[in-house]
């Protein structure tokens, strides 16, 4: 059957933790992605931003998991209106920001 949203969220959090733990080498060779308003945009916007990163095996699983939260197919640049002041950040920082946001959602019980 389908994975309950809270379980899927926990799995996504765990994957993001796997990516970040004690990691000092630049993630995805230091690739930059659009910084986004996670509160306003959610999973589809996060996926949109990460869709611009290709050839980075470290985040492929994350990309797949995010697509499971997004009800429609996302193409790069689809949510450009939700980019934060045309600001780009490193993938590693993006992942950490996303991780904190997801933990906040989970603690607030928004997926239970």
């Amino acid at each position: 059957g389908p994975v309950p949203p809270s379980t899927a969220l926990r799995e996504l959090i765990e994957e993001l933790v796997n990516i970040t733990q004690n990691q000092k080498a630049p993630l995805c060779n230091g690739s930059m992605v659009w910084s986004i308003n996670l509160t306003a945009g959610g999973f589809c916007v996060a996926l949109d931003s990460l869709t611009n990163v290709s050839g980075c095996s470290a985040i492929e699983k994350t990309q797949r998991m995010l697509s499971g939260f997004c009800p429609h197919k996302v193409s790069a640049g689809q949510f450009s209106s939700l980019h934060v002041r045309d600001t780009k950040i490193e993938v590693a920082q993006f992942v950490k920001d996303l991780l904190l946001h997801l933990k906040k959602l989970f603690r607030e019980g928004q997926f239970n």
């Epitope: 765990e14 733990q21 004690n22 990691q23 000092k24 080498a25």
Partner: antibody
Framework: EVQLVESGGGLVKPGGSLRLSCAAS????????MSWVRQAPGKGLEWVGR??????????NYAAPVKGRFTISRDDSKNTLYLQMNSLKTEDTAVYYC?????????????????WGQGTTVTVSS | SYELTQPPSVSVSPGQTARITCSGD??????AYWYQQKSGQAPVLVIY???KRPSGIPERFSGSSSGTMATLTISGAQVEDEADYYC???????????FGGGTKLTVLG
């Protein structure tokens, strides 16, 4: 004040079992990744294992010498960490410390074990 | 299993600079952490993420990392710095911790 207090150490025969506890206070225990580290008499520090916070999956990892014999668990409602030690060997004789990265792991970083308990002594001898 | 290698001992005179090294194959991608342990006491974190100093640790303690080698430097070592020093990191998966064998620092008083 941030504090970790271990208990449960003692003398046990080879093949026996023991459960250590680590009571935490002064920080948000549920956010913390907790570790056990041991030190045999006159020897160096040895990483035993670690448990992530529940929100980070609650997963455990163990050093090869203890894998399959030791189990780390946590009770966030009691702010307590546990180390269940089975099939004990004489080489498990050591001071056992619990330690934590009380802040960093929650933010996707790892700041090292910045808080340690005073240790509890485990002696395995016939 | 993954190992971190440290020299067993380092000796300096008071006021001199002490350098303690730690080598490991995963150190180019994983951070090193340094702990000080005085006799009969629990370890104390003195450096995290290769080069960052926790609050309360004197400025004479610093850390660096290059390639497979991490280094703890104590500039102007003092008698109270005499202790065992351990480097700590993880294997390449990030899941398994490891300590170096420890280095006994002697400050010749």
């Amino acid at each position: 004040e941030v504090q970790l207090v271990e208990s449960g150490g003692g003398l046990v025969k080879p093949g026996g079992s023991l459960r250590l506890s680590c009571a935490a206070s002064g920080f948000t225990f549920s956010n913390a990744w907790m570790s056990w580290v041991r030190q045999a008499p006159g020897k160096g520090l040895e990483w035993v294992g670690r448990i992530r916070s529940e929100i980070d999956g609650g997963t455990t990892n163990y050093a090869a010498p203890v894998k399959g014999r030791f189990t780390i668990s946590r009770d966030d409602s009691k702010n307590t960490l546990y180390l269940q030690m089975n099939s004990l060997k004489t080489e498990d004789t050591a001071v056992y410390y619990c330690a934590t990265d009380q802040v960093g792991a929650y933010y996707g970083d790892y700041y090292g074990m910045d808080v340690w308990g005073q240790g509890t002594t485990v002696t395995v001898s016939s | 299993s993954y190992e971190l290698t440290q020299p067993p001992s380092v000796s300096v005179s008071p006021g001199q600079t002490a350098r303690i090294t730690c080598s490991g194959d995963a150190l180019p991608e994983k951070y090193a952490y340094w702990y000080q342990q005085k006799s009969g006491q629990a370890p104390v974190l003195v450096i995290y993420e290769d080069s960052k100093r926790p609050s309360g640790i004197p400025e004479r303690f610093s850390g660096s990392s290059s390639g497979t080698m991490a280094t703890l430097t104590i500039s102007g070592a003092q008698v109270e710095d005499e202790a065992d020093y351990y480097c700590h990191s993880t294997d390449s998966s990030g899941n398994h911790g490891v300590f170096g064998g420890g280095t006994k620092l002697t400050v010749l008083g």
